[in-house]
């Protein structure tokens, strides 16, 4: 349905508050270095313009596309060239190339200062003094650091952020009330950002079909009672929503997401019995709730898959005439029967099935050729099962910190060229799979673990893409979306790596380590561990453990000393010498 003025249409659909918030998010995700005040000014200008279009859709420029309007506005920023360099060249292009250009310049790791949380009283004062500015600043700071954050979901986070301050700034113990809520929002926010980044990478690097396949598998697990046609409709709509958000079309995305939530709730009887509670909530909570809803129960007495996908005489005809439909049905039927499998495993099985049909259907006896196709699935299923079993055992034996360290060593040996901060960040996140997933029963472990690992490895892939240093990482990241984890798992020690020159400065520590939080102290030690492996990639687990134990003792000792700085200087030299000797450096 064509509208005379797209900007008026979206303003009316979303309302002023959401319109302004989404435009701010869009601008902050494109121009990540611009000051808050500059963005607020641009947003206000766009909002005033939108209001003129609501009043008269035929007014000048109201018929322009949102990309044209927003791009023109972004290109008015005076400091574009000096702040963003070649991104300024985007402004010389016409739409749609200009928007594509802006998208290509989004930075997953922007050079921005770490967000330091002020004192609770300071935050509460700022919140009370100007609630609107305080919340806008939250949107701005998150959006610029997470340029692919799912915009409608960020509105939900902002709503919760506001609720936390509204409640806790009146509490007797403000800090006890507020800080856990902020920690929870921060951790959930990081997880949400990473999950959305994978969706965007899937769409942008592997295409719409890859995303749709993922969505068919996931929605079929979640809504196993829904018919294939219903799942297909939801997949089409969900793909449109995420394509829009990943493409910077945040107003359309938020609007379409609301429409999808409305449709799901109006048709919940034919979708899932688990949606009732979600559908009673207000819009933002409703959409979030639907996205996180638990899997419905599987229908009883589902027939064997073999009848339609192995034994039927029409298998090859159906495959050849409409691969998307036939393989989509295969994926749907397999996924709804297997909530215990990861989505990526289901996609591997579907790919194996497809490859077998492609190989067999032109043969003299196609059925004989593909009759044992389901047997080919067994090793594919067992591989992640065994890996998860082994790693959960290791996690239970070591605990999270030491499990992370084991992964740090493992991944540094696999891809030592990757920057130390990236290896630390990614390995720490990989290590969190233990506490996140190993507590689950067998039936929930694989979907939890392997799909989480896909999200974390995508972080490695997007960070590495910015400054590629390892052909092995590039290969695992680009060859197959669903085989990224097996590809990284299969990597052995990189024998071509030339060990890094020893630099004592890397292993010099100061008294400031004593005032760090436990998390920050862990990161310091893990950074040292990565550097150690880069210097001595052939070091054994035992050697590394001994050095790290000595290091932990050294930090503990010097943090208890009266003259901490002297202790770090003198004992540090001894530790470096002892470590070099222990590792044969």
């Amino acid at each position: 349905d064509a509208h005379k003025s797209e900007v008026a249409h979206r303003f009316k659909d979303l309302g002023e508050e959401n319109f302004k918030a989404l435009v701010l998010i869009a601008f902050a995700q494109y121009l990540q270095q611009c000051p808050f005040e500059d963005h607020v000014k641009l947003v206000n200008e766009v909002t005033e313009f939108a209001k003129t279009c609501v009043a008269d859709e035929s007014a000048e420029n109201c018929d322009k596309s949102l990309h044209t309007l927003f791009g023109d506005k972004l290109c008015t920023v005076a400091t574009l060239r000096e702040t963003y360099g070649e991104m300024a060249d985007c402004c010389a292009k016409q739409e749609p190339e200009r928007n594509e250009c802006f998208l290509q310049h989004k930075d997953d790791n922007p050079n921005l200062p770490r967000l330091v949380r002020p004192e609770v009283d300071v935050m509460c004062t700022a919140f009370h003094d100007n609630e609107e500015t305080f919340l806008k600043k939250y949107l701005y700071e998150i959006a610029r650091r997470h340029p692919y954050f799912y915009a409608p979901e960020l509105l939900f986070f902002a709503k919760r952020y506001k609720a936390a301050f509204t409640e806790c700034c009146q509490a007797a113990d403000k800090a006890a009330c507020l800080l856990p809520k902020l920690d929870e929002l921060r951790d959930e926010g990081k997880a949400s950002s990473a999950k959305q980044r994978l969706k965007c990478a899937s769409l942008q690097k592997f295409g719409e079909r890859a995303f749709k396949a993922w969505a068919v598998a996931r929605l079929s697990q979640r809504f196993p009672k829904a018919e294939f046609a219903e799942v297909s409709k939801l997949v089409t709509d969900l793909t449109k929503v995420h394509t829009e958000c990943c493409h910077g079309d945040l107003l359309e995305c938020a609007d379409d997401r609301a429409d999808l939530a409305k449709y799901i709730c109006e048709n919940q009887d034919s979708i899932s019995s688990k949606l009732k509670e979600c559908c009673e909530k207000p819009l933002l909570e409703k959409s979030h709730c639907i996205a996180e809803v638990e899997n419905d129960e599987m229908p009883a007495d589902l027939p064997s898959l073999a009848a339609d996908f192995v034994e039927s005489k029409d298998v090859c005809k159906n495959y050849a005439e409409a691969k998307d439909v036939f393989l989509g049905m295969f994926l749907y039927e397999y996924a709804r029967r297997h909530p215990d499998y990861s989505v990526v495993l289901l996609l591997r099985l579907a790919k194996t099935y497809e490859t077998t049909l492609e190989k067999c259907c032109a043969a003299a006896d196609p059925h004989e050729c593909y009759a044992k196709v389901f047997d080919e699935f067994k090793p594919l299923v067992e591989e992640p099962q065994n890996l998860i079993k082994q790693n959960c055992e290791l996690f239970e034996q070591l605990g999270e910190y030491k499990f992370q360290n084991a992964l740090l060593v493992r991944y540094t040996k696999k891809v030592p060229q990757v920057s130390t901060p990236t290896l630390v960040e990614v390995s720490r996140n990989l290590g969190k799979v233990g506490s996140k997933c190993c507590k689950h029963p067998e039936a929930k472990r694989m979907p939890c673990a392997e799909d989480y690992l896909s999200v974390v490895l995508n972080q490695l892939c997007v960070l590495h893409e910015k400054t590629p240093v390892s052909d092995r990482v590039t290969k695992c990241c680009t060859e197959s979306l669903v085989n990224r984890r097996p590809c990284f798992s299969a990597l052995e020690v990189d024998e071509t790596y030339v060990p890094k020159e020893f630099n004592a400065e890397t292993f010099t520590f100061h008294a400031d380590i004593c005032t760090l939080s436990e998390k920050e102290r862990q990161i310091k030690k893990q950074t040292a561990l990565v550097e150690l492996v880069k210097h001595k990639p052939k070091a054994t687990k035992e050697q590394l453990k001994a050095v790290m134990d000595d290091f932990a003792a050294f930090v503990e000792k010097c943090c208890k000393a009266d003259d901490k700085e002297t202790c770090f200087a003198e004992e540090g030299k001894k530790l470096v010498a002892a470590s070099q000797a222990a590792l044969g450096l």
């Epitope: 295409g207 090859c316 495959y319 005439e321 497809e354 049909l357 492609e358 190989k359 032109a362 003299a364």
Partner: antibody, heavy 119, light 110 residues
């Protein structure tokens, strides 16, 4: 040596019919998929259809109804009915690369046979 | 409707030149089902590349295929006298009935 050899081309009047043959030697035809592809003078290649080793056939959307592919033990046939001037082209038979069924990978081709539809 | 657009329709080049031919498909091809053929006057086409980037046995390594989804490229890195010919891309889709070829790029001597 593996060879595909088309025959049966020639001049035919609009509305007429023609049956082309593709004689296959050097391989056991019962194990391979064979396609028909045509090329109008100075124009694009155009896929007509395929017959799998099992005898199952598929056709380009535009070719359904007027064109029929069949086979015996050593020869693949293309039956063309209700011919029109725009069917004038060189007609090739071509083998699909073994191990594929629906992919457009044709590794062995005949030399082609010219069909002219004119009154 | 399936549309496969090859560009340029012709290119003049000299021996030793690098030549790039593009093939754009709408919609995207199925699972990188994209091939490149070489055809010389009066001859049948010859398969050079399949699965977008895999070289057929016996084809010189100066031929390189790349791309995925909707955009594909054939690059001849160092043109040889025997490379002057017409090049076609071929695409496979969700339905076998949609198998389509591009309309060719003629590589001529400058």
């Amino acid at each position: 040596e593996v060879q595909l050899l088309e025959s049966g081309g020639g001049l035919v009047q609009p509305g007429g019919s023609l049956r082309l043959s593709c004689a296959v030697s050097g391989i056991d035809l019962s194990n391979y998929a064979i396609n028909w592809v045509r090329q109008a003078p100075g124009k694009c290649l155009e896929w007509i259809g395929i017959i799998w080793a099992s005898g199952t056939t598929f056709y380009a959307t535009w070719a359904k109804g007027r064109f029929t592919i069949s086979r015996d033990s050593t020869t693949v046939y293309l039956q063309m009915n209700s011919l029109r001037a725009e069917d004038t082209a060189v007609y090739y038979c071509a083998r699909t690369v073994p191990g594929y069924s629906t992919a457009p990978y044709f590794d062995l081709w005949g030399q082609g046979t010219l069909v002219t539809v004119s009154s | 409707d399936i549309v496969m657009t090859q560009s340029p329709s012709s290119v003049s080049a000299s021996v030793g030149d690098r030549v790039t031919i593009t093939c754009q498909s709408s919609p995207s091809v199925w699972s990188n089902f994209l091939s490149w053929y070489q055809q010389k006057p009066g001859k049948a086409p010859k398969l050079l590349i399949y699965e977008a980037s895999k070289l057929t046995s016996g084809v010189p390594s100066r031929f390189k295929g790349s791309g995925s989804g909707t955009d594909f490229t054939l690059t001849i890195s160092c043109l040889q006298p025997e490379d002057f010919a017409t090049y076609y891309c071929g695409g496979g889709y969700s339905s076998i009935s949609d198998t389509t070829f591009g309309c060719g790029t003629k590589v001529e001597i400058k």
